[in-house]
């Protein structure tokens, strides 16, 4: 059974992930972002189901495309280099899902824009955090 300290650690990691995703979304939605139209042409795979930490596998599998899109954005829209942001997310995701068994992600048939993709994972983080608090 998870201890209170492991639950707290999970909560903090989810909050960190949430902040990183929100930072990316805010940087993209910045009204001064001239690359937004181009960024919205990139398609992302959405998870069929995202209700447990193991489903973060689906986010992990989209990190490289996410980095590619962020590289289009003006760097001043972000506090960190896109690569550093994505690497931070990579480390947190691995820590959070960290299970022995490999979970094979199932994707929805419809692809999504980067904004829809980020909103989906932001909602996921918020939902899991709410169950921990």
């Amino acid at each position: 059974a998870p201890t209170s300290s492991s639950t707290k650690k999970t909560q903090l990691q989810l909050e960190h992930l949430l902040l990183d995703l929100q930072m990316i979304l805010n940087g993209i939605n910045n009204y001064k972002n001239p690359k937004l139209t181009r960024m919205l042409t990139f398609k992302f795979y959405m998870p069929k189901k995202a209700t447990e930490l193991k489903h973060l596998q689906c986010l992990e599998e989209e990190l490289k495309p996410l980095e590619e899109v962020l590289n289009l954005a003006q760097s001043k829209n972000f506090h960190l280099r896109p690569r550093d942001l994505i690497s931070n997310i990579n480390v947190i995701v691995l820590e959070l899902k960290g299970s022995e068994t490999t979970f094979m992600c199932e994707y929805a048939d419809e692809t999504a824009t980067i904004v829809e993709f980020l909103n989906r994972w932001i909602t996921f983080c918020q939902s899991i955090i709410s169950t921990l608090t």
Epitope: E61, K64, S87, N90, V91, E95, T102, M104
Partner: antibody
Framework: EVQLVQSGAEVKKPGESLKISCKGS????????IGWVRQMPGKGLEWMGI????????RYSPSFQGQVTISADKSISAAYLQWSSLKASDTAMYYC???????????WGQGTLVTVSS | EIVLTQSPGTLSLSPGERATLSCRAS???????LVWYQQKPGQAPRLLIY???SRATGIPDRFGGSGSGTDFTLTISRLEPEDFAVYYC?????????FGGGTKVEIK
């Protein structure tokens, strides 16, 4: 279970060409980088380069740029490392590994021993 | 490129003892990019620690990583017989990805 299975050991002569393979299974092959690492006899690890099978984006270490070619065939979940003209100094164990975006090599193949000798 | 220097080159210890391995970088980078591997003779390397301090799946908690900037440490709190091996640090803070020269932990 994530697995990377490499092709068997090779014995070649200087000047010959060679292509070794790495087949991935148990995960979405197109969503992760595959890296190649050289280990010369009794020596440490050297990163050669990476390929992202999803779009064939390839990056090389400056030390290996122009010396080898990294490629992939996503239809069969395979990555390749090839030489057009081998040298005796290419004798080494070559490993493929799945590489996360932050750089950690989390799953490794068993290695392919390449021996180049006249 | 970032050069990683590992010390000592060889560490001679007995089972049950504590091992402290050092990895020093020629320039500073985010700890997200620091990784440790273990390699036993005739085997492929195995991921131990990523993000400087996070244990990989299935790695016992006697293995611990710490550090930031240019100085990183791998600690094995109590050496087990199966821990005698070569340990490599690795960075990807900037391209190319580089490895340290390795530290061999041998039985005293």
């Amino acid at each position: 279970e994530v697995q990377l299975v490499q092709s068997g050991a090779e014995v070649k002569k200087p000047g010959e060409s060679l292509k070794i393979s790495c087949k991935g299974s148990g995960y979405r092959f197109t969503s992760y980088w595959i890296g190649w690492v050289r280990q010369m006899p009794g020596k440490g690890l050297e990163w050669m380069g990476i390929i992202y099978p999803g779009d064939s984006d390839t990056r090389y270490s400056p030390s290996f740029q122009g010396q080898v070619t990294i490629s992939a065939d996503k239809s069969i979940s395979a990555a390749y490392l090839q030489w057009s003209s081998l040298k005796a100094s290419d004798t080494a164990m070559y490993y493929c590994a799945r590489q996360q975006v932050a750089g950690m090599l989390d799953y490794w193949g068993q290695g392919t021993l390449v021996t180049v000798s006249s | 490129e970032i050069v990683l220097t590992q010390s000592p080159g060889t560490l001679s210890l007995s089972p049950g003892e504590r091992a402290t391995l050092s990895c020093r970088a020629s320039q500073s980078f985010s700890s997200s990019y620091l990784v440790w591997y273990q390699q036993k003779p005739g085997q492929a390397p195995r991921l131990l620690i990523y993000g400087a301090s996070s244990r990989a799946t299935g790695i016992p908690d006697r293995f611990g990583g710490s550090g930031s900037g240019t100085d990183f440490t791998l600690t094995i709190s109590r050496l087990e017989p199966e821990d005698f091996a070569v340990y490599y640090c690795q960075q990807y803070g900037s391209s190319p990805l580089t490895f340290g020269g390795g530290t061999k932990v041998e039985i005293k």
